[in-house]
């Protein structure tokens, strides 16, 4: 089939980085500057993406692959192929249309992007809170209250294991 296709369509022999030039009797010509073809058999080369302004060049365009952009520090990429730049926030914040706002009590965000998420509810797993949550960090769940030694509060770590044969003081 490939052999048949080649006989029918001389353009199928043109490799990536070239195009099948109809103006030159279907000879494979190299892509002109600032253009590329990422697959063989192309009749035209695509124009390279230009990373302008706040879009910075992460990878230069070559004859076989498009340029890749990222965003200036302070912003991060969104969308296919970094089609948008969205502002970063600090940990403990989320982005709203009013800008970066602190996470509400009971929620956290440990990244520069994304939304504030509720703290883990330790009691749903029958566990206690070992370390309280903050705007930047989730709670740390510890053993279940029943596993704690008598008198221990839910926010303190369990007492160290005792040697066999010793009774509590």
């Amino acid at each position: 089939f490939e052999r048949t296709r080649s006989l029918q369509d001389p353009c199928s022999n043109c490799p990536a980085g070239t195009f099948c030039d109809n103006n030159r009797n279907q000879i494979c010509s190299p892509c002109p500057p600032n253009s590329f073809s990422s697959a063989g058999g192309q009749r035209t080369c695509d124009i390279c993406r230009q990373c302008k302004g706040v879009f910075r060049t992460r990878k230069e365009c070559s004859s076989t692959s498009n340029a890749e952009c990222d965003c200036t520090p302070g912003f991060h990429c969104l969308g296919a192929g970094c089609s948008m730049c969205e502002q970063d926030c600090k940990q403990g914040q989320e982005l709203t249309k009013k800008g970066c706002k602190d996470c509400c009590f009971g929620t956290f965000n440990d990244q520069k992007r994304g939304i504030c998420r509720p703290w883990t509810n330790c009691s749903l797993d029958g566990k206690s809170v070992l370390v309280n949550g903050t705007k930047e960090r989730d709670v740390v769940c510890g053993p279940s209250p029943a596993d704690l030694s008598p008198g221990a509060s839910s926010v303190t770590p369990p007492a160290p294991a005792r040697e066999p044969g010793h009774s509590p003081q």
Partner: nanobody, 123 residues
């Protein structure tokens, strides 16, 4: 071609005022949120202000609240930033940016940016 072109930057003394303009072309301006962002020398890019499609919602970063005013003229495809009581720390390249489709709902990404206009506040 979709394009944003800023103008109006320059040198101004502390306490002075400037009005930046952004001319939009190649897209339906009135259907997009629009933004201003800035990058001070040696600092990260910072969002400054945004405005919704009809100008009824406007938001600002805390550091410019009460001093800067964002506005738009949909009939003339123009965005503005009136900057009053300017300070040395407002020195930056100011960028106009279009909110992408879904801005304010699913994300706050900006997909079209101008090349910027430079504001220098110095005595």
């Amino acid at each position: 071609e979709v394009q944003l072109v800023e103008s109006g930057g320059g040198l101004v003394q502390p306490g002075g005022s400037l009005r930046l303009s952004c001319a939009a072309s190649g897209f339906t301006f009135s259907t997009h949120w629009m933004n201003w962002a800035r990058q001070a020398p040696g600092k990260e890019l910072e969002w400054v202000a945004n405005i919704n499609q009809d100008g009824s919602e406007k938001y600002y970063v805390d550091s410019v609240e009460g001093r800067f005013t964002i506005s738009r003229d949909n009939a003339n495809n123009s965005l503005y930033l009136q900057m009053n009581s300017l300070r040395a720390e407002d020195t930056a390249v100011y960028y106009c940016a279009r909110g992408g489709v879904g801005y304010g709902d699913s994300h706050f990404g900006m997909d079209v940016w101008g090349l910027g206009t430079t504001v220098t506040v110095s005595s």
